[in-house]
Interface confidence: medium
């Protein structure tokens, strides 16, 4: 006699927060402490993420959802789900293998993260430098010589940040 398998897997009845315990005739058992299952029908619970070191707990682990981490002050998240923390630098600096280093002359960084970027070359747009750049700020381009006729006074705002997803502060 061959027992026909039920069309419906008994484990599919186990809700999130439980697992289908093969050692107990596939009874739905609660996830043990420090573990979770975010979907039904799981045969095991996943170990909760621990936020330690530079990672801080943003959301505690529950039986149905993993813990979420962010970074301690002075660091910022990188990667999906804040899988890494990267050190902040000051404005006017960038992070290198040797720690935070000042932007080289002719470059700037107006954020605590990211790289130093070249000042805008005003002359490429036929404009002149109205305000010089610094390590922290891009140059401000002013009107071209031709625009300096009486009645003309337009100033181009600083170029937007060129790193996708990062807006200037």
């Amino acid at each position: 006699f061959e027992r026909t398998r039920s069309l419906q897997d008994p484990c599919s009845n186990c809700p999130a927060g439980t697992f289908c315990d093969n050692n107990r005739n596939q009874i739905c058992s609660p996830c043990p402490p420090n573990s979770f299952s975010s979907a039904g029908g799981q045969r095991t619970c996943d170990i909760c993420r621990q936020c330690k070191g530079v990672f801080r707990t943003r959301k505690e682990c529950s039986s149905t959802s993993n813990a979420e981490c962010d970074c301690t002050p002075g660091f910022h998240c990188l990667g999906a789900g804040c899988s890494m923390c990267e050190q902040d630098c000051k404005q006017g600096q960038e992070l290198t293998k040797k720690g935070c280093k000042d932007c080289c002359f002719g470059t700037f960084n107006d954020q605590k993260r990211g790289i130093c970027r070249p000042w805008t070359n005003c002359s490429l747009d036929g404009k002149s430098v109205l305000v010089n750049g610094t390590k922290e700020r891009d140059v401000v381009c002013g009107p071209s010589p031709a625009d300096l006729s009486p009645g003309a006074s337009s100033v181009t705002p600083p170029a937007p940040a060129r790193e996708p997803g990062h807006s200037p502060q």
Epitope: G79, M84, L95, T96, K97, K98
Partner: nanobody
Framework: EVQLVESGGGLVQPGGSLRLSCAAS????????MTWFRQAPGGGLEWVAN????????YYVDSVEGRFTVSRDNAKNSLYLQMNSLRAEDTAVYYC????????????????WGQGTTVTVSS
């Protein structure tokens, strides 16, 4: 399980020495930059030193240059921080972390941290 465990901290007098160790497990240690950080009482985390995969590149924060030496033994899956001429301002919890300030092409992030070991420099 990916894990880092620091040891070797303790109480030492100014001018003394300590050697911190960081034992790695659960990953291929020799593939990663490794970094030491510290956190003084009431302060933020400060990068101390880092070392590349084979130990040929080492970098230090200015305040410990010439006094601290970072090293590693890939055969033992271990990272070390030899601290000489210790000062009161070196008092902190010291953490090792996987990754480093420049271990990847696109980021400088650390993803695995130890629990820390406490170093107290006091007379």
């Amino acid at each position: 399980e990916v894990q880092l465990v620091e040891s070797g901290g303790g109480l030492v007098q100014p001018g003394g020495s300590l050697r911190l160790s960081c034992a790695a497990s659960g990953f291929t240690f020799s593939n990663y930059w490794m970094t030491w950080f510290r956190q003084a009482p009431g302060g933020g985390l400060e990068w101390v030193a880092n070392i590349n995969q084979d130990g040929s590149e080492k970098y230090y924060v200015d305040s410990v240059e010439g006094r601290f030496t970072v090293s590693r033994d890939n055969a033992k899956n271990s990272l070390y921080l030899q601290m000489n001429s210790l000062r009161a301002e070196d008092t902190a919890v010291y953490y090792c972390a996987r990754g480093g300030l420049g271990y990847g092409d696109s980021h400088y992030g650390m993803d695995v941290w130890g629990q820390g070991t406490t170093v107290t420099v006091s007379s």
